[in-house]
């Protein structure tokens, strides 16, 4: 019957436009590492698809770090002459915007967003918590910024920049942050501590969004919510980095955090699922 026919329509990655990354580490975010040196290095930016400069702290970090622009291009671009920000009116979307939504093989019920190439809009879906593909964003805004066309046919990228339709330059845009501080991290960091329903007294930490700090609380051992971390370090890593401070009205935003190691993975893989 028709349901059987539908059942056997398998969504396969072979039918989708492939990611053109030569190495998976080319998709890592730039990671300055926890040290405090100031070293000029280069990384491959998957959103602009260009090798760009960043300041490296001198230790740790990740493999998306190169001594020279040439080395970066050699490792991460297939065709050095093929500049990605094209001299056309519209910036090309990253290839992963055209991938089908993929919940992955795990089942953690995480709300994520993907770009639907049929509707040309970003839509919500349930992500399982592992694998899947890169058409997977934590926020609707991030998905729109990367994959949707702007009102005038240009792409908006997730660094608060737009491709200027006149001279193809990247120009900063207002970030419309309503107050001096705004939280851009996981939503559960804003929830109150929840002890849960059982009778244990386990030492845990939660993020107190009012004071912007991680605080200890006693967890009962079951139930509760996701604002629940086994260490202060884990809590800070998950929630503190989302605390955003404006530089000035209409200016760019930066993360208010001490220079420390922030785990960097491919953007779509930064997730949290409780051990169920």
């Amino acid at each position: 019957d028709s349901e059987e026919d539908e059942e056997h329509t398998i969504i396969t990655d072979t039918e989708l436009p492939p990611l053109k990354l030569m190495h998976s580490f080319c998709a890592f975010k730039a990671d300055d590492g926890p040290c405090k040196a100031i070293m000029k290095r280069f990384f491959f930016n998957i959103f602009t698809r260009q090798c760009e400069e960043f300041i490296y702290g001198g230790c740790e970090g990740n493999q998306n770090r190169f001594e020279s622009l040439e080395e970066c291009k050699k490792m991460c671009t297939r065709d050095n002459a093929n500049r990605i920000i094209k001299t056309t009116l519209q910036q090309e979307k990253p290839d992963f915007c055209f991938l089908e939504e993929d919940p992955g093989i795990c089942r953690g019920y995480i709300t994520r967003y993907f770009y639907n190439n049929q509707t040309k809009q970003c839509e919500r879906f349930k992500y399982g918590g592992c694998l899947g593909n890169m058409n997977n964003f934590e926020t609707l805004e991030e998905c729109k910024n990367i994959c949707e066309d702007g009102p005038n046919g240009f792409q908006v990228d997730n660094y608060g920049t737009q491709l200027n339709a006149v001279n193809n330059s990247l120009t900063p845009q207002s970030t419309k942050v309503p107050s001096l501080f705004e939280f851009h991290g996981p939503s559960w960091c804003l929830t109150p501590a929840d002890r849960g329903l059982c009778r244990a007294n386990e030492n845990r930490f939660y993020y107190n969004s009012v004071i912007g700090k991680c605080r200890p609380f006693k967890y009962s051992g079951c139930g509760g919510n996701e604002n629940n971390f086994t260490s202060k370090q884990e809590c800070l890593r998950a929630c503190k980095k989302g605390f955003i401070q404006r530089i000035s009205k209409g200016g760019l935003i930066k993360t208010k955090r001490k220079r420390k190691k922030q785990r960097v993975k491919i953007a779509y893989e930064e997730i949290f699922v409780k051990n169920m």
Partner: antibody, heavy 123, light 112 residues
Framework: QVQLQQSGPGLVKPSQTLSLTCAIS??????????WSWIRQSPGRGLEWLGI?????????RYAVSVKSRITINPDTSKNQFSLQLNSVTPEDTAVYYC?????????????WGQGTLVTVSS | DIVMTQSPLSLPVTPGEPASISCRSS???????????LNWYLQKPGQSPQLLIY???NRASGVPDRFSGSGSGTDFTLKISRVEAEDVGVYYC?????????FGQGTKVEIK
């Protein structure tokens, strides 16, 4: 108790197609809390994951790049089984082939395996 | 592909003594929020592999508590607190951080 029962020929000629079936009992191939995979084991390559299928809102699959051009994994919902087809085999494809269930809910891992089928590619 | 490297490749053990197997991944498998995309399996002689540890440190159902998994970043360890004769076989680590899913080359545990 989930059980996976493998069937298929143990000898395949070079350039022909290797076909194996994995019959599932105690679970459903269409379950949205599982995924179904083929993995092979040979002395030279150890355990090598070949591909996986899973049903959520629709069917999905993923294949290892090393076999992507030659592999097909299909579900058969009427018989509650899934199959492996590997085209254009060579002696390098000689291995013990396992089907396995990926537990999607709590234990994210291959928690049930078939008994294994030794497939020899030889003329 | 993420390469999983195990050591030692062979581990002679004495029953009642502890044993430890190391697994190193070529990329970090631990996320900011504490999930470790790493599993451990045991393949006993003549059998199919069986899941021992999932998500880095959780014992699968029916696995004795003498088995424990730990580690973070790229370095992981499987420990057997007191080895028993039935623990002999080949132990494998496996990552599911990214496709393709990959296994370590295996550590053969045998009784001295």
């Amino acid at each position: 108790q989930v059980q996976l029962q493998q069937s298929g020929p143990g000898l395949v000629k070079p350039s022909q197609t290797l076909s194996l079936t994995c019959a599932i009992s105690g679970d459903s191939v269409s379950s949205n809390s599982a995924a179904w995979s083929w993995i092979r084991q040979s002395p030279g390559r150890g355990l090598e994951w070949l591909g996986i299928i899973y049903k959520r809102s629709k069917w999905y699959n993923r294949y290892a790049v090393s076999v992507k051009s030659r592999i097909t994994i299909n579900p058969d919902t009427s018989k509650n089984q899934f199959s492996l087809q590997l085209n254009s085999v060579t002696p390098e494809d000689t291995a013990v082939y396992y089907c396995a269930r990926w537990h999607s809910d709590k234990m994210w891992g291959f928690d049930d395996w078939g008994q294994g089928t030794l497939v020899t590619v030889s003329s | 592909d993420i390469v999983m490297t195990q050591s030692p490749l062979s581990l002679p053990v004495t029953p009642g003594e502890p044993a430890s197997i190391s697994c190193r991944s070529s990329q970090s498998l631990v996320f900011s929020f504490g999930i470790t995309y790493l599993n451990w399996y045991l393949q006993k002689p003549g059998q199919s592999p069986q899941l021992l540890i999932y998500k880095g440190s959780n014992r699968a159902s029916g696995v004795p508590d003498r088995f424990s998994g730990s580690g973070s970043g790229t370095d992981f360890t499987l420990k057997i607190s007191r080895v028993e004769a039935e623990d002999v076989g080949v132990y494998y680590c496996q990552q599911y951080d990214s496709y393709p899913l990959t296994f370590g080359q295996g550590t053969k545990v045998e009784i001295k």
